[in-house]
């Protein structure tokens, strides 16, 4: 899509901070009086040349887009306004990292795209790590252990944070059925300085892509941009995505017919929102209005109880959340392949849980 | 003298929608910012978002995207705020304000409109 | 985004005092501040930029300081004319935020 808005956000940042240079005199407004240093022309024209070079990526999907030609037109004007030659420096975007205390440590500077390596070296010790996961009919394990069935439709937040977006989008199981499964998962991983250019990842059921929706499989040309990349296993029904510039790995499956999600994010990283940004699945749950219990079921097809708990127990011998949830979700949809999503689930909690005591969690209902 | 003269006072309904206008003489209006601060009131200021016409592009804060649309026509050298959606906690004095360096929101807002007063009440 | 919290909330001095007003930022912003005063009723007026930088016609008692979280404005000798209420904003990020506003009374 037209990405015209992603560049002018870009210039807009990389604008705020320049100061002094140039002919400044000149691009004071007539409002207060004169003031000296301020934005100087040769800053200025590092921005437009790099807005204009952004314009020119995107160019191709914004034909007929009103505000990416009155842009075009705008920073050809400034440039001409300001004697800016075509070919020269480019800003940089401006710096988003996770903040990060001590960086005038006296050691050389630790990689920026690395997290948890510079994480390490400024702390003195590995970030903190949480795991939320999102599967089945689809139950929420949230960071803090919650574990919650959810009744939602349509597209809900299980992340909204300074550097990632994801969104479940869910619809019922079968016609008439209370409980959901989610069919397709969007992610969006947010532009970073000297990491990755935005890129947006975006899975439906029987279409699992290993590459992000611009084709490519890492982070873009910046420097850092190996510091995010997709790979997979299994083409069709698992892909891995790891970002370690803010030290995320994220998985998900396909199984029956429903999409799963997993991941693992560091502490810093996963709670760097803001109050506006309170609706995630991931750090509350699911809202209590949107929760079910597991009283609440109305069962399809042949499959009893006994041979529901006997189908999940097979793969899942602690009766915890897990298993509960499995149980659940064969019930309702009628579908033994169900069994597959809590077992991956709970296996991916496996890999992900920094507290491995955490691991099985005990619904009270 | 760069000068920025508001629409007048609104009272609206619950649910509604307000467009403020902001309009600029006796300086250059198109590749200066504007940008929209509201105050509720015996509150603080909070930005909503901003445009720099000459780009036509609008930049909000997140807390009012999709709520918020800010426009300039600089045929008339004039910007416009629009909120939809209002509810009484939208009750506040709407201020459009002009950047104080071209092509920048950066160093402050030089140039300030009067304030136009906007009520939400059923 | 970025917080900005100043202190106090307000205040009350007799005029010819000095009067401090502290402003911080939840990240390092540098010197990218600005002071506004706001007389009741009135818009906003810039009075200082780039943390310590008087924006011209702006009387030379009111002075500001500080770099990366923590700022100072400060009235060298209060006037009556003074009376009004003092913001903090930062401008290294969008959206650029206010710090709650210092009211300042004579007493």
């Known amino acids: 899509q037209c990405k015209i808005l992603r560049c002018n956000a870009e210039y807009v940042s990389s604008t705020l901070s320049l100061r002094g240079g140039g002919s400044s005199g000149a691009l004071r407004g007539g409002g207060g009086g004169g003031r000296g240093g301020g934005v100087g022309s040769g800053g200025l024209c590092r921005a437009l040349r790099s807005y204009a070079l952004c314009t020119r990526r995107t160019a191709r999907t914004c034909r007929g887009d009103l505000a990416f030609h009155s842009a075009v037109h705008g920073i050809e004007d400034l440039m001409i306004q300001h004697n800016c030659s075509r070919q020269g420096p480019t800003a940089p975007p401006p710096p988003r990292g996770p903040a990060l205390p001590g960086a005038g440590s006296g050691l050389p500077a630790p990689d920026p795209c690395d997290y948890e390596g510079r994480f390490s070296r400024l702390h003195g010790r590995p970030p903190g790590f949480l795991h939320c996961a999102s599967f089945g009919d689809p139950h929420v394990r949230s960071f803090h252990h919650h574990f919650h069935t959810c009744r939602v439709q349509g597209a809900w937040p299980l992340l909204d944070n300074d550097f990632l977006f994801v969104q479940a989008t869910s619809s019922p199981m079968a016609l008439g059925a209370n409980a959901t499964a989610t069919r397709k998962l969007t992610i969006i991983f947010k532009n970073m300085q000297e990491c990755i250019d935005q890129k947006v990842y975006q899975a439906e059921v029987d279409n699992l892509p290993v590459a992000f929706e611009d084709g490519s499989i890492n982070g873009g040309d910046r420097p850092g941009g190996s510091s995010l990349s997709i790979q997979t296993a299994n083409p069709g029904n698992h892909v891995e995505i790891q970002a370690a510039y803010i030290g995320t790995t994220i998985i998900i499956r396909q199984t029956a017919g429903q999409l799963s999600f997993s991941i693992k994010v560091a502490e810093d990283v996963a709670m760097a929102f803001s109050a506006e940004q309170d609706l995630q699945l991931c750090v509350g749950g699911c809202p209590p209005s949107q929760r079910l219990s597991r009283s609440e079921r109305n069962r399809r097809g042949a499959i009893t109880i006994d041979t529901a708990r006997r189908l999940c127990k097979e793969g899942l011998p602690v009766e915890d959340a897990y298993f509960h949830s499995c149980v659940f979700d064969v019930l309702i949809s009628g579908d033994p392949n169900f069994t597959v999503a809590a077992q991956a689930a709970l296996e991916d909690a496996r890999a992900f849980l920094p507290d491995l005591e955490k691991l099985h969690l005990f619904p009270s209902d | 003298q760069v000068q920025l003269v508001q629409s007048g006072a609104e009272v609206k309904k619950p649910g509604s929608s307000v467009k403020v206008s902001c309009k600029a003489s006796?300086?250059?209006?198109?590749?200066?910012?504007i940008s929209w601060v509201r105050q509720a009131p015996g509150q603080g200021l909070e930005w909503m978002g901003g445009i720099i016409p000459i780009f036509g592009v609008a930049n909000y804060a997140q807390k009012f995207q999709g709520r918020v649309t800010i426009t300039a026509d600089e045929s008339t050298s004039t910007a416009y705020m629009e909120l939809s959606s209002l509810r009484s906690e939208d009750t506040a004095v709407y201020y459009c304000?002009?950047?104080?360096?071209?092509?920048?929101?950066?160093?402050?807002?030089?140039?300030w409109g009067q304030g136009t007063t906007v009520t939400v009440s059923s | 985004d970025i917080q900005m919290t100043q202190s106090p909330s307000s205040l009350s001095a007799s005029v010819g005092d000095r009067v401090t007003i502290t402003c911080q930022a939840s990240?390092?912003?540098?010197?990218?501040l600005n002071w506004y005063q706001q007389k009741p009723g009135k818009a906003p007026k810039l009075l200082i930029y780039?943390?310590?930088n008087l924006e011209t016609g702006v009387p030379s008692r009111f002075s500001g300081s500080g770099s990366g979280t923590d700022f100072t404005f400060t009235i060298s000798s209060l006037q009556p004319e003074d009376i009004a209420t003092y913001y903090c904003?930062?401008?290294?990020?969008?959206?650029?935020?206010f710090g709650g506003g210092t009211k300042v009374e004579i007493k």
């Open positions: 304000a002009r950047g104080a360096y071209e092509a920048t929101y950066g160093l402050g807002m030089d140039v």
């Open positions: 006796g300086g250059t209006f198109r590749s200066y910012s």
């Open positions: 904003q930062q401008l290294v990020d969008l959206p650029p935020t």
């Open positions: 780039d943390a310590s």
């Open positions: 990240q390092d912003i540098s010197n990218y």
